[in-house]
């Protein structure tokens, strides 16, 4: 009974619910993540426990500092929900649920080029497709390492397309594309495709 009274005596502003967060919210399978459980009251000795559904994953004590739980997301069911419990001697509170979004990384995209050659111009169509990776995928096209398109979002497994017209160039142009989904800091590039300079029959991608 005393413990219950003691807990009731701790006003909500003195011992509110803890906060559970992670710097990484979108992850791929096999990724190591850190989860932070923190509390507004910095002068209490707090025991933090982390749960995934009803499974207890670990316990840490601290005062003034968040508890840091390091874990690896290897299976789909490990996406969550996670919950953190903050406990003082006679009182405990739970955080809101936290879940990760598991995303499959994009594989290196394939760049295809189609060219219609006129006397003065080249009409170039670039196609880029990554056959694996969670949708949506953002594609960006590059010419000589400079982005020439905005990010093109594809919500289906269809190639992104970008058209450009160029005066018949005197120099080689190198094209490549980038595929990126919601995984932060994880982008892949196609192999570069070199478009030869004009002169003779040097247009292997041209439609005759």
């Amino acid at each position: 009974r005393k413990a219950v009274l003691d807990c009731e005596a701790m006003k909500t502003n003195e011992f509110p619910s803890p906060c559970l967060d992670s710097k990484t919210k979108v992850v791929m399978k096999g990724q190591n993540v850190s989860m932070f459980c923190s509390h507004k009251n910095k002068s209490l000795q707090i025991t933090y426990s982390l749960f995934r559904r009803k499974t207890h994953l670990g316990t840490q004590d601290g005062k003034g500092e968040p508890a840091i739980f390091n874990l690896s997301i290897t299976e789909a069911h490990e996406s969550g929900p996670y919950k953190c419990k903050a406990q003082v001697t006679s009182c405990s509170k739970y955080s809101r649920d936290f879940s990760f979004t598991i995303v499959d990384p994009v594989t290196s995209p394939v760049l295809n080029i189609m060219v219609i050659q006129t006397e003065t111009d080249r009409h170039i169509t670039l196609h880029c497709l990554s056959v694996n990776g969670s949708l949506p995928i953002n594609y960006t096209f590059f010419e000589n390492h400079v982005a020439i398109s905005p990010a093109i979002s594809k919500y289906d497994r269809e190639p992104a397309e970008f058209n450009l017209t160029k005066k018949n160039p005197g120099e080689e142009e190198e094209y490549r594309c980038e595929a990126k989904n919601r995984l932060p800091n994880y982008a892949t590039y196609s192999h570069p495709v070199t478009m030869p300079s004009t002169g003779g029959d040097s247009c292997p991608f041209c439609l005759k």
Epitope: N41, K42, S43, D61, G62, K63
Partner: antibody, heavy 119, light 110 residues
Framework: ESQLVESGGGLVQPGGSLRLSCAVS????????VGWVRQAPGKGLEWIGI???????YYASWAKGRFTISKDNSKNTVYLQMNSLRAEDTAVYYC?????????????WGQGTLVTVSS | DVQMTQSPSSLSASVGDRVTITCQAS??????LDWYQQKPGKAPKLLIY???KLASGVPSRFSGSGSGTDFTLTISSLQPEDFATYYC????????????FGQGTKVEIK
Amino acid sequence: ESQLVESGGGLVQPGGSLRLSCAVSGIDLSSYAVGWVRQAPGKGLEWIGIIGRSGSIYYASWAKGRFTISKDNSKNTVYLQMNSLRAEDTAVYYCARDVDSRPPTGSLWGQGTLVTVSS
Amino acid sequence: DVQMTQSPSSLSASVGDRVTITCQASQNTYSNLDWYQQKPGKAPKLLIYQASKLASGVPSRFSGSGSGTDFTLTISSLQPEDFATYYCQSTSWGSSYVGGFGQGTKVEIK
């Protein structure tokens, strides 16, 4: 009356080991964190580490590896295991209950136990 | 580890003087800061805990203030028994942070 009493100090040869005990009375070890602090002769206070209520342990970076803190709640005792001792580990070793804010309680220290590392 | 920088490292003062000792933490330690008084051959004695709370039995001439990284211990009117060494201690601790002591301030008779 709450009390902490250290024991286990004494003379030890360089490279040797020693286990210090901190017997706690009037305090429930499952309700408070207890830390270890040392003071070399003529020097300042040096924080070694702390063991929390649930048993998580944190060390000063210099103490990791050679020093190990543990506790036995049933005996209401906290331990400091010290390995590979060196002359510079000669000091008075104190255990102390950590400050908490509910109920508002200041820290409480033992009287200290002297460890001398010498051949 | 948190670094606690105490200043001055020593000071000379007379009975009745107002004495101020400062302590700066290298990281935010909130209000988790204690002040201790130590006399030769004795265990440290707690004066102030949680930055500003007076420990039991400590005279009211001792006071503490500050939060975050900057803290102050003030003795409003120095008494003969106050000549000693004073230490600050960060008492925050956890996964990413461990406490520590300042190097001490020796208060001597002028």
